[in-house]
């Protein structure tokens, strides 16, 4: 039954609607016209519309679709690059603050060994930095570094003071004693394990917060193909050739349609799912050794039980040390006394209270929150993007894409749209390269994250003592595990009152330009009704 | 007594790739941070790269990352630069050095010099 | 360009003293230490000071440096004419993340 023919007869509302999108009218019909040119908006009678019209409505159909995308991702999309932002810039001052009480330390109890403590200090968090950024580096060598370069201060100015300042030439022995004679006893292998359980999950939730960005990047320009294209123009355009320009498309024929057009996009979301997931239980597992704020900011107080533990055996080093690097010294120096009161009896030693106000732990957890609504992000995308474009409410009086339609029906659309375009084609396509590579690196992070996530009954946790120290990490004489400080101390409280100093705002809703329209470029915006306002995030 | 000496410099044109080596001896090198610093003809010096004790960790200046790799052999107790890419301003002397933030011995240096 | 600054020359007569100034900022000297190297023409440099003010076994008393902010000095005491060398001043750059040096002094005895 042939459709009705153009209510104007003149082709001249099409032409004036198009006219928006492409200035000058030689490519407008002035009375309609058999149309036997046309690819996509296929008459049946005849049309107001030519080929390169249909050209133009293709372009402008992709440019709309990946501005609807773009506009779908925008909330997610802030949200994850704020909180990376964030999280990095809270990282850095925790390493900040965790350098200045160690600083702070060696000045209050250890003056003579500035300022090399504070170069030795200094590269050792520059290490922690670099690596929490993704640098190179071995945990176990910064550590490493750190007591070895240390103890040739500690002997030649606490335990040796009598020695020269060119002390260079017995470097060379002591950092040998150091390792040899375990001098920090089980300190060292103790930074060792709680600085690389703890940094290694940082370093992995930045990755994992960067990787998220990255993949709404990828989705978020996306070049759509010519197929898609096509079908887009055939469902917001091709009503215009035949006059009938504020008819909408029929809802159920939309998403029969944007599922073609996002077929690959939509094989992200397995992936995506197990993502969100795998990083809140990362984040869960984030405390005690697997929190960074918590051992770098608690670090001051393993060292300088460390010094205190050398100088305890002080004596006992001295001697055997005096003997190993006899050939490096010229004479036998006094060794420095210490009296028995310096050491603070392990029994009646306080752990410093920590208060939380806000800390890190609290904002990893908001985060999740907030990650997990958007959990149906890409299996919600062709939904979410008919819903913010103009379509029939109940599929009633509507576009099929060929003919306005009193009721949508699936079946006698994909009928009617066989001769014209294969739609299960454009499904067996499979995800373009650009999203397989994207697929592949959530595969891996996922893996890297799955890793790191232990078990909710770690065992690990049950061998900690209040300190966090691991069992097994302190030999049979307790004193190698002192876990509290001395005279001089810093207290460390409010431990993440310095998040104050954060420029940042992690609230959302306000992000800038959540209320835009899902619009195409001025120029384009009347072509396409009114898409409506992006309200409601992609949930 | 402590000694480093360089070997691997010579004339190679740009696009090109040279090693150099850096022997070691009269300390223990594998609890040593080694570095590579490089002086152009007539100007001043340049640090290029470091590595850590154990070779576990490694640093880069920004002119060079991702066309030099440092890397070290402690049973050998040899460090060494893998220049590739190299381009016309990498000519200069290169010299190892033993230390990463400061450089207390230095070897006599080789001259690499990148040329068409 | 130099991250930190040295005036390209300094003379003396024997017996005279030359301070040679290394001028940084927040972000080396200000935060870490200063090591002095000298440097004869033709061969390696060899390390005069390190830690701000402390000498290697084998460096003359003659050689003092010290550092006050983001600036640091090497004073040569009772110039020699061996004296006549490069100096150079180098310092990690916690921004860089890396050892900036002076472009280095010529030091001259007249």
């Known amino acids: 039954q042939p459709p009705p023919p153009p209510p104007d007869a003149t082709c001249h509302q099409v032409r004036s609607f198009f006219q928006r999108l492409q200035p000058g009218l030689k490519w407008v019909p002035e009375t309609p016209v058999p149309g036997s040119d046309l690819q996509v908006c296929l008459p049946k009678g005849p049309t107001c519309c030519s080929r390169k019209m249909e050209e133009k409505y293709q372009l402008t159909a992709r440019l709309n679709m990946e501005q609807l995308l773009q506009s779908a991702s925008m909330e997610l999309k802030f949200l994850i690059i704020q909180n990376a932002a964030v999280f990095q810039e809270a990282f850095e001052i925790v390493v900040r603050h965790a350098k200045n009480y160690t600083n702070a330390m060696f000045k209050n109890n250890y003056p003579s060994l500035t300022p090399q403590a504070f170069e030795f200090v200094g590269e050792f968090f520059t290490d922690v930095s670099l690596y929490i950024l993704g640098s190179d580096i071995n945990v176990d060598d910064m550590v490493n570094e750190l007591f070895d370069s240390l103890f040739p201060v500690i002997y030649t100015q606490l335990m040796n003071p009598g020695l020269p300042d060119s002390a260079l030439d017995i470097n060379e022995c002591l950092r040998g004693a150091r390792r040899d004679l375990k001098v920090f006893g089980n300190f060292p292998k103790l930074i060792m394990t709680q600085v690389s359980k703890s940094l290694q999950v940082t370093r992995i939730f930045l990755q994992a917060l960067n990787l998220g960005i990255e993949v709404i990047n990828t989705t978020d320009h996306l070049k759509f193909s010519k197929d898609c294209g096509r079908m887009l123009t055939r469902m917001w355009y091709c009503s215009y050739c035949q006059g009938l320009m504020m008819v909408k498309p029929c809802g159920g024929y939309c998403n029969v349609v944007m599922q073609g057009c996002m077929a690959g996009v939509v094989e992200i979301d397995k992936y995506w799912r197990e993502y969100i997931l795998s990083l809140e239980e990362l984040v869960n597992g984030m405390y005690r050794i697997y929190d960074m704020e918590n051992v770098l900011l608690g670090l001051f107080s393993t060292i300088h039980d460390s010094i205190q533990y050398v100088q305890k055996n002080a004596g006992k080093l001295t001697t055997t040390i005096g003997k190993l690097c006899a050939h490096s010294q010229q004479r036998q120096y006094r060794s420095a006394y210490y009296p028995e009161d310096l050491f603070i009896d392990k029994k009646v030693l306080k752990v410093a209270h920590v208060e939380h106000e806000e800390t890190l732990s609290s904002r990893r957890r908001e985060l999740i929150q907030k990650l997990k609504s958007f959990i149906s992000f890409y299996s919600a995308l062709p939904g979410y993007i008919c819903s913010h474009s103009p379509v029939a409410e109940n599929d009633t009086l509507c576009w099929n894409g060929q003919e306005l339609v009193e009721r949508y029906s699936q079946k006698a659309a994909r009928n009617g749209m066989k001769n014209q375009f294969n739609l299960h084609e454009l499904k067996m396509k499979g995800p373009e390269p650009v999203v397989s590579q994207i697929i592949d690196k959530l595969k891996h992070i996922n893996q890297l994250l799955r890793t790191m996530s232990m078990p909710k009954g770690r065992v690990l946790d049950k061998n900690l003592d209040e300190e966090g120290f691991e069992s097994g990490d302190c030999g049979d004489d307790e004193d190698e595990c002192i876990g509290g400080s001395g005279d001089g101390m810093i207290k460390v409280k409010n431990q993440l009152r310095f998040l104050a100093e954060l420029a940042y705002d992690l609230d959302v809703d306000d992000a800038p330009g959540n209320s835009q329209q899902a619009t195409p470029k001025d120029n384009e915006i009347s072509t396409f009704h009114n898409l409506g306002n992006v309200h409601s995030p992609l949930k | 007594e402590v000694q480093l000496l360089e070997s691997g410099g010579g004339l190679v044109q740009p696009g090109g790739s040279l090693r150099l080596s850096c022997a070691a001896s009269?300390?223990?090198?594998?609890?040593?941070?080694m570095s590579w610093v490089r002086q152009a003809p007539g100007k001043g010096l340049e640090w290029v790269s470091a590595i850590s004790g154990s070779g576990g960790s490694t640093y880069y200046a920004d002119s060079v990352k991702g066309r030099f790799t440092i890397s070290r052999d402690n049973s050998k107790n040899t460090l060494y630069l893998q220049m590739n890419s190299l381009r016309a301003e990498d000519t200069a002397v290169y010299y190892c050095?033993?230390?990463?933030?400061?450089?207390?011995?230095w070897g006599q240096g080789t001259m690499v010099t990148v040329s068409s | 360009s130099y991250e930190l600054t040295q005036p390209p020359s300094a003379s003396g007569t024997p017996g005279q003293r030359v301070t040679i100034s290394c001028s940084g900022g927040s972000s080396n000297i200000g935060s870490n230490t200063v090591n002095w190297f000298r440097q004869l023409p033709g061969t390696a440099p060899k390390l005069l000071v390190y830690f701000n003010n402390q000498r290697p076994s084998g460096v003359p008393d003659r050689f003092s440096g010290s550092k006050s902010g983001t600036s640091a000095s090497l004073a040569i005491g009772g110039l020699q004419s061996d004296d006549e060398a490069d100096y150079y001043c180098?310092?990690?750059?916690?921004?860089?993340?890396?050892?900036?040096f002076g472009g280095g002094t010529k030091v001259t005895v007249l």
């Open positions: 050095a033993r230390g990463k933030r400061y450089f207390d011995y």
């Open positions: 180098v310092a990690w750059d916690d921004s860089l993340n890396a050892p900036v």
């Open positions: 009269g300390f223990t090198f594998s609890s040593y941070a």
